[in-house]
């Protein structure tokens, strides 16, 4: 996601499963910290946004032709699992300790 | 990158190394097809944008709170190498067949 002024970084995003309609199958938690990647990918791209070569190239092209080519985008580059209690196909409450890819661990420019 | 209306897809982006100042060390090619990921990550996220669970969650939260949370972003999810001829530290023209991460192979919503 983009953000005016600030550089690409991980910010808080509390997600309530009821808000997204997942409370029908996720019993616990009621909400969790998903985090969000926010901010711009500005030149020069810092090491902490772990840019790919393509992101560096795109940033340089954007610098030269800002209306033709977009900036790289601030996105999750590493995700973490969360633990959930959910209803399986049989309606049985089931614990899953590693429900993968639910929370941002790291953000970067891609 | 985002794009008004169209959904996340790979589009052409010809990069001339002179435009980005890399012609000082990359001798060949003069330009190459980098591609760019353009378009929006709209609900519902299609399979072809290979969304992560976090991207799906963020899309749903954006749907509910569009001003608070951004959409997922259309970014390169797989990159390809290119061949380059470059001047090494000794100034010797050197061929590298797999200069990684320079061209977009696939785009997705993250």
């Amino acid at each position: 996601s983009t953000g005016a002024g600030s550089h690409c970084q991980k910010t808080s995003l509390r997600v309530n499963f009821e808000d997204i309609g997942w409370n029908s199958w996720i019993i616990a938690p009621k909400e969790y910290e998903a985090y969000e990647c926010k901010g711009g990918c500005f030149f020069p791209l810092a090491d902490d946004v772990t840019p790919t070569k393509h992101a560096i190239v795109q940033t340089l092209v954007h610098l030269k032709f800002p209306t033709k080519v977009g900036k790289a985008c601030c996105v999750p580059t590493k995700l973490s699992p969360i633990s959930i209690l959910y209803k399986d196909d049989m309606g049985v409450p089931t614990l899953k300790y590693h429900y993968e890819g639910m929370s941002v661990a790291e953000c970067g420019c891609r | 990158s985002t794009g008004a209306g169209s959904h996340c897809q790979k589009t052409s982006l010809r990069v001339n190394f002179e435009d980005i100042g890399w012609n000082s060390w990359i001798i060949a090619p003069k330009e190459y097809e980098a591609y760019e990921c353009k378009g929006g990550c709209f609900f519902p996220l299609a399979d072809d944008v290979t969304p992560t669970k976090h991207a799906i969650v963020q899309t749903l939260v954006h749907l509910k709170f569009p001003t608070k949370v951004g959409k997922a972003c259309c970014v390169p999810t797989k990159l390809s190498p290119i061949s380059i001829l470059y001047k090494d530290d000794m100034g010797v023209p050197t061929l590298k067949y797999h200069y990684e991460g320079m061209s977009v192979a696939e785009c997705g919503c993250r």
Epitope: - | A28, P29, S83, D88, P93, L95
Partner: antibody, heavy 114, light 107 residues
């Protein structure tokens, strides 16, 4: 100065194998791929393949797949090219050449004759 | 594989002549093209790399041009030591290929 010195001429019988060496000096051996090129008498140049001296990974021309093996010994900065199941058409001068073909060995004549 | 076609196969010229050799690739190779000179019993010598870059130590009478599929080697004023065979070579594809050669002979 930068140079590549190859092993001496060889005479082989059809069906045999030959192993040509190429010793590098004057530069860091592991910094550049090593190519092998051959030239039959009165003919043009034919690229055979290359070896990356760091990992030892290779890329062979399709024509030589299954018959050529390129290896290296980084401790003595030497690359090797072995060609098996020799036939008379393999009679040629074999050259090693550094990455961008800026430096070449002197060539090794391999004669295949019964 | 990418085919490299040189023309002419041979040419006769005099000292002082301007000589042009062309090379055409069967598909686009950007500027991944080199030119070599080879004299009898010797290894080839790199003259031009990346289509138009003069290799260190090569006389400035040699020049190269072109991009994509069509390339040219020019010798602005032929010298006695320039009589040799000239080869073009593409390094765009991982399967490297040479042209068949152009023999430059004394008229």
């Amino acid at each position: 100065q930068v140079q590549l010195v190859q092993s001496g001429a060889e005479v082989k019988k059809p069906g045999a194998s030959v192993k040509v060496s190429c010793k590098a000096s004057g530069y860091t051996f592991t910094s550049y791929y090593m190519n092998w090129v051959r030239q039959a008498p009165g003919q043009g140049l034919e690229w055979m393949g290359w070896i990356n001296p760091v990992q030892g990974n290779t890329n062979y021309a399709q024509k030589f797949q299954g018959r050529v093996t390129m290896t290296r010994d980084t401790s003595i900065s030497t690359a090797y090219m072995e060609l098996s199941r020799l036939r008379s058409e393999d009679t040629a001068v074999y050259y090693c050449a550094r990455n961008y073909f800026d430096v070449w060995g002197q060539g090794t004549l391999v004669t295949v004759s019964s | 594989d990418i085919q490299m076609t040189q023309s002419p196969s041979s040419l006769s010229a005099s000292v002082g002549d301007r000589v042009t050799i062309t090379c055409r690739a069967s598909q686009t190779i950007s500027n991944f093209l080199a030119w070599y000179q080879q004299k009898p019993g010797k290894a080839p010598k790199l003259l031009i790399y990346a289509a138009s870059n003069l290799q260190s130590g090569v006389p400035s009478r040699f020049s190269g041009s072109g991009s994509g599929t069509d390339f040219t080697l020019t010798i602005s004023s032929l010298q006695p030591e320039d009589f040799a065979v000239y080869y073009c070579q593409q390094l765009y594809a991982e399967s490297i290929t040479f042209g068949q050669g152009t023999k430059v002979e004394i008229k």
